[in-house]
């Protein structure tokens, strides 16, 4: 197995996590996918999970956390709006594949949300767009009480998080710093260690 | 390793049908969109279409010079892309090229090495 | 249709020497922060090779003297050092909307 990767997110109370999780294969656009904090000694718990199929560009929303799987993209939008100190934790983004076990998509998350705002009110043209509003179309869906106990042994393909906050609240003045992204593994890579039970010849990308 | 070959070019006269065929080896085919991309004696490259995966209902794109007149489509169990050319016009003669993404809406990572297609009475 | 556009068409570069080609989309080829811009090499009799995806990204076994930036609309490939074996015609390309389009290439050779 693949060494576990990690990526740390350290945000304000307030702000909003961004996460877009890469699945790349049109195999899994109408799998049900999932939002997962990881606590010490504990299987992954589902927090937010699409419907079943998963339906295109369908926003659903349980709580402060938004799911939005883009199909045509081969993309998870999660985004975790309003973040309270609580949040922080480990978070992964999977796929539900009944009856095998779920699979992580991409690095696990390590939110740290701290107390407090950066930068200035006012504009916020750098930012992203502003997500802080939820919004008023949104399904909650109803998630598998299973959860894997050896979820993710897969290095990730890719996976890109940003913030954004109220205009009001706060100026992002360098949102780089917050972007962060990660290189991509092959597709075949992803493919033989989702679902494919041949023995293909794997290359990486660096 | 991925493999791309091309095969059914050759000469034809304008208003004439020609059907070329991709057989790919080295990956699980029926997992990936395949397109097809030609290129005029030095010219550019000019996408072609795509022909999606059976989870996608093998849907089909192409591109504005030729939909209506080509048509791609796909054998999984034959590991094999294709591509039907109807009428075709004098400007149809490239080297056509079939290319696997890597995903959804992803880069040509493979290219076979094309087939030569000339259209002239 | 989205339409790529490269500058130069051509260009010449002294070998050592860096090379930049510019890609230009008329409307943005981002879907949030992922850039579905892709960079190509054609060396004559050749069928084109994969550079770089999704703007910045350096596909396994090219040359680390090969990069990318850029994104919404404006997209850069650079060689930082030109090698001989670099001579070839470089295209961009885009798959975030249908139809996909290529830029018209531009070559480039030593100086």
């Known amino acids: 197995a693949t060494k576990l990767t990690e990526e740390k997110y350290e945000l304000k109370e307030g702000q909003t996590l961004d996460v877009k999780c890469d699945y790349t294969l049109e195999k899994f656009a109408s799998s049900q996918k999932a939002w997962q904090i990881i606590r010490d000694g504990e299987m992954p718990k589902t927090l937010a999970c699409t419907e079943r199929p998963s339906k295109n560009s369908h926003p659903v929303q349980v709580g402060r956390i938004i799911l939005e799987d883009y199909h045509d993209h081969g993309l998870l939008r999660v985004r975790m709006v309003n973040l309270q100190v609580e949040d922080s934790g480990l978070y992964q983004c999977v796929i539900y594949q009944p009856p095998k076990e779920p699979h992580m998509l991409f690095a696990r998350i390590r939110l740290v949300v701290t107390k407090g705002f950066s930068g200035t009110p006012g504009s916020n043209e750098n930012s992203t767009q502003n997500v802080y509003k939820i919004p008023p179309t949104t399904t909650k869906a109803l998630c598998p009480l299973y959860t894997s106990p050896r979820t993710v042994t897969q290095a990730p393909p890719k996976s890109t998080a940003d913030v954004s906050t109220p205009d009001s609240e706060i100026n992002l003045t360098n949102v780089t710093d917050i972007i962060r992204e990660q290189k991509l593994i092959s597709e075949e890579d992803l493919e033989q260690k989702l679902i494919s039970e041949e023995d293909l010849h794997h290359h990486h990308h660096h | 390793e991925v493999q791309l070959v091309e095969s059914g070019g050759g000469l034809v006269q304008p208003g004439g049908s020609l059907k070329l065929s991709c057989a790919a080896s080295g990956f699980t085919f029926s997992t990936y969109a395949m397109h097809w991309v030609r290129q005029a004696s030095g010219k550019g490259l000019e996408w072609v279409g795509r022909i999606r995966t059976k989870s996608s209902n093998y849907a089909t794109y192409y591109a504005a010079s030729v939909k209506g007149r080509f048509t791609i489509s796909r054998d999984d169990s034959k590991n094999t892309a294709y591509l039907q050319m109807n009428s075709l016009k004098t400007e149809d003669t490239a080297v056509y090229y079939c290319t696997r993404d890597m995903g959804i809406r992803r880069q040509f990572a493979y290219w076979g090495q094309g087939t030569l297609v000339t259209v002239s009475s | 249709d989205i339409v790529l556009t490269q500058s130069p068409d051509s260009l010449a570069v002294s070998l050592g020497e860096r090379a930049t080609i510019n890609c230009r989309a008329s409307e943005s080829v981002d879907t949030f922060d992922y850039s579905f811009l892709h960079w190509y090499q054609q060396k004559p009799g050749q069928p084109p090779k994969l550079l770089i995806y999704r703007a910045s990204n350096l596909e396994s076994g090219v040359p680390d003297r090969f990069s990318g930036s850029g994104s919404g609309t404006d997209f850069t490939l650079t060689i930082s050092s030109l090698q001989a074996e670099d001579v070839a015609v470089y295209y961009c390309?885009?798959?975030?909307?249908?139809?996909?389009?290529f830029g018209q290439g531009t070559k480039l050779e030593i100086k």
């Open positions: 390309q885009q798959s975030n909307e249908d139809p996909y389009t």
